[in-house]
Structure formats: C-alpha cells, structure tokens
C-alpha cells in the first residue's frame, strides 16, 4: 500500500504533504484545511497541466470567505516547476487568508508574472523565504513578486538564488523590512552584495545575515553597506572565508554606529580582523583559527565576546598558567 501523501499531526497544527506520484491526488491536501502550518512538496512535478484545470484569471473574491476561514499562518511549497500564472493565481487567493509566513523552496518558476490588477489585494505577509527558486524573468523577479505583496513584509530570506542581484530600478522600497537574509549564496561576493542591496530600498533593516556568501573582508562588507545606505544593528558574516587584513590601498570604512552585534564565527580567521567597529555589544569570533590571544588594540570594546573553539583557548595548547585564557568550554566546531 502506498503511504498517504498528507499527514496531519494530532493537534491539527502541522500538516505535511509529499506528492511523489506522477499523477497525484491533489484533493488529499484538503485534510490540511484545519492546520496552522502547512508544507506541500510536489516531488519535482511540473504543474503546467494544472493551468488547464483551473481558471487562473477567475475573480478570487468568490473564494474569499472560504479562504478567510483557513487557519493556515505558515505555508511551505517546494519541489515543483510552477508557471508564473499559477503562482500569481495562488497568491491572489491567499491574499484573503490569514497567511503570515510563506516559504518557497526548490521551485522553478516559468513564464512571466502578470502585473497586479487594479482591484487586486496584495498578500499581507510578514515573512517570505525563498530557497533555490529560479525565475524565468532573471533579475526582475523580485520587483515582479513584490507587486503581489503588501508593503508590510518584515523578513525576507533568499538562499541559493540563481540571480541574487536585483533589478534595483524596478524594485520598490521595503519600508517595514527589518531582517534580510542572503545566506547560502556563495557566489554573491562583495560586489554582488552591492548589487543586491539596492540603495535606499531597505531603509529599516536591523538584521542582515550573510552566512556563506563569498564575503572576503569585514571592511569590504562595510563599504557595500555604506554604499547602499544600509545600517543594520546585527550583521552575520559567519561561514565565510574571511581575510583578517585589509588591502592597504582600500579606503578605510567607517562602520555605522547602529551596528552592535557582529558574528564572525566559522570564518577561518587566524587573527582578529582589522577595521572592526570600535564598540560592539556582541562579537562572536568562535570556531576560528586564532592561535594566539588578542592584544588590547586588536579587539573592539565588547560587552559580550565569544572566542570558544579557537586553538589558543583549547586545553593542552601551552597556556602560560592555569586559569588564564581558558573558558573551559570547547564547542563542536
């Protein structure tokens, strides 16, 4: 017997569907109507034939009452080839729901997204997460998707993007966006970051995550942020192969005074990088390759410093005397 494609937990809270059959019975998903968190994985199916069975241009207001009754707050859709028209149809319907967080992963969006009709309502998401989503429209995809969203988006995460740079002139500002996560785009680099951080389009950013994005130096990131007018409070540069030294010919970059938390863990650093902000609330340098203790002018003034997992702290590596330089905590690095 083939397993049921959809499973709803005992609390009617989380429902997960894995449609792996070539001809799936999509009606199975109806058992998820009572769930708050819904995940639908389409097994890599091409949803093009779906367009023949649904009227993507139908007025979604006819479904408004039904959709409003849904409990779903978090929706994940993954592993499919989706025509842009179908995606738009879904977004139009979901605009009447109470959906707050949408995650799209391992999707190939084909075709172009039509413009938002005048009478249409945007989707009032607080969080949008995209992982390994490719768009036929190249760099203009964010601008096209944005028009289907209300301007209250707070969290935007874009990982494994095929085109992490955006067509900035087409993108409107994200006035409420406080968290931008561009992690896991190893080809981004500092120049790509400058292109992705469309100047003045992200005025409210407080948290910027750039894990595993091909960043090279904290100073280079500083320059990209300054050019874009982005002033995060928290910056995550962990899991990049960072160089500690700055190119002497490169101009010095003044970090924004707003920055108070900097994560430089797992960055392969052999010394504390030059050109860090003078004062930080949090600095994470854990799991690097620091093989000697920092001297007083090598560290900024930090309230909360993490250095665990560096060779100079590891027990058994010639400490000058007991108690010094050893936190006693050896994290798994």
């Amino acid at each position: 017997t083939t397993p049921e494609p959809c499973e709803l937990d005992d609390e009617d809270f989380r429902c997960v569907c894995n449609f792996s059959e070539p001809q799936p019975d999509w009606s199975e998903a109806f058992q998820c109507v009572s769930a708050v968190e819904v995940e639908i994985h389409a097994g890599g199916l091409n949803l093009e034939p779906f367009l023949k069975r649904v009227d993507a241009d139908a007025d979604p207001r006819q479904y408004a009452d039904t959709v409003k009754a849904l409990r779903v707050r978090r929706l994940t859709v993954g592993a499919a080839q989706v025509p842009a028209q179908l995606l738009v149809g879904a977004l139009r319907v979901l605009a009447y729901s109470r959906l707050k967080e949408l995650t799209l992963e391992d999707l190939k969006i084909t075709g172009t997204m039509p413009p938002l009709p005048l009478e249409a309502t945007g989707l009032a998401l607080s969080s949008l997460r995209l992982r390994n989503v490719s768009w036929a429209t190249g760099r203009s995809w964010l601008a096209e998707l944005q028009q289907w969203l209300k301007p209250g988006l707070k969290v935007l995460s874009i990982a494994q993007a095929h085109s992490p740079a955006f067509s900035c002139e087409q993108v409107r500002a994200f006035p409420a966006l406080t968290s931008l996560d561009l992690s896991d785009n190893p080809g981004l680099g500092e120049r790509g970051l400058m292109a992705a951080l469309c100047p003045h389009k992200f005025p409210a950013i407080q948290n910027l995550a750039l894990r595993n994005t091909g960043m090279e130096t904290p100073t280079g990131v500083c320059a990209a942020l300054a050019a874009a007018g982005v002033q995060p409070h928290s910056l995550d540069l962990s899991h990049n192969s960072l160089r500690a030294t700055v190119n002497p010919s490169a101009p010095r970059c003044m970090w924004s005074s707003a920055l108070n938390s900097l994560n430089l863990s797992f960055a392969g650093l052999e010394q504390v990088p030059k050109g860090l902000p003078a004062k930080l609330r949090v600095l994470d340098l854990s799991c690097n390759r620091l093989n000697r203790a920092p001297q007083p002018d090598e560290l900024p003034e930090v309230d909360n410093l993490t250095l665990d997992g560096n060779p100079f702290l590891v027990p058994g590596t010639a400490l000058p005397h007991e108690g010094s330089m050893n936190s006693g905590v050896v994290p798994a690095c």
């Epitope: 001297q295 007083p296 002018d297 003034e301 410093l305 050893n326 006693g328």
Partner: antibody, heavy 125, light 108 residues
Amino acid sequence: QVQLVQSGHEVKQPGASVKVSCKASGYSFTDYAMNWVKQAPGQGLEWMGWINTQTGKPTYADDFKQRFVFSMDTSASTAYLQISSLKAEDMAMYYCARSTFYYSSYIYGWYFDFWGQGTSVTVSS
Amino acid sequence: EIVMTQSPATLSVSPGERATLSCKASQNVGSNVDWYQQKPGQAPRLLIYKASNRYTGIPARFSGSGSGTEFTLTISSLQSEDFAVYYCMQSNTNPPWTFGQGTKVEIK
C-alpha cells in the same frame, strides 16, 4: 620559566635622555603585549601605556604622550622605554609588565602576570 | 579616565586577623579589577585577576569579590609576609588602565 629582566639603575642630568630595556624570556615575546608602569619615590603605581608586540604600535596614557617612547626589538625579545628631556619629576622606578589575556564565557580582559624587577632612574644635576 | 579610589589608606591589623580592603571605581568596570601586592624594594605581584580569580600559587587566604563599581580584597588570616601595600587596578576591556593609590597593611 617566564622572566622579564630590566637594565640597571640610571643616573642622568636634567635634559638628558635615558633608555630602559626589558628582556623577555621563557615565552613567545610577540604573543603578549608589554606595559610600562611608573612608581615615583614613596608614591603609588602609574600605568604609562603599552606596546603591541605584534605590530610595534605603542599606546600612551595621557600623562606620557610627550617625551616618552616605547619601542621593541623582536629578534632580541626586548622592549624599550626611552625618556627624553629628563625632568626632576621623571625620577622614579620604572617597571615593565606583561599583559595576559583572560577569557571566560563572554567576559574578557587583560592583567599583568609577570613584572620586571624595575629600573631606577635618578635625575640629578 | 576611570578613577580608582582605595580605602583605607592604611590598615593596622594584628597577625591572624582578617583584613578587608576596599576599591571603588568612578564608573562601571564590570569584573575588570585586579589586585597586586607590593613589598618594599620589590616589584608588584599579581594576587587576584578579574575581581575574584586567585592567580596561580596565591594562598587561599586571599580572596576578591565585587563587580560594577565596588570591589573588595579580603585576607582571611594575616600572616607576617602579608604586610605590604596592595593596589587595585581597573583593566576595563580596553586601555587606559588605572591603579588605585594603594592601601598599606601594617602590623598593629
């Protein structure tokens, strides 16, 4: 074992210069910052500043920004304090002291774990 | 600049008695206070680092406490070799660092 050995007692005239040395042994000289501390006769300890032994960059306390120079010779594992245009108020015992880094669950700082025996500088005409 | 104020200037104690030395910082220094002992004609010697950590080889009768702006060095039972001058020093993360003016512990 860790040792800081300073040069001997100096007697100088006002206006002259003096150079005090501090030779480190028993550890890697460039792994620890070196500080200088002044103690005038019958007085307390006064932190003068320090030198980054990786870069050679000195940092001076406000009262020691003129006439005082910290330097080092990595190959000789030696730090130096030079005082120019000596004045009567420079008459004191000068100590070098090694800074060791302390870290434990988010808290960090430095303390002076090893001190030289001190070099007495007398300024007299 | 952070000012460290030690009290009393002189403490007269009989051998075997307890001695309590105080050190006040003019602003919050967290736990970044170290204590040093200096005997006549000798270099200072580290006793306590980061407010309460006894340095290697320092007898258990020496203990430190406090955080923020108020710090204490306690010698639980004074031995003849403990009569000396004691200095607190704030080493608040980054320089400049400053010493207190010292407390002389003398035989009563």
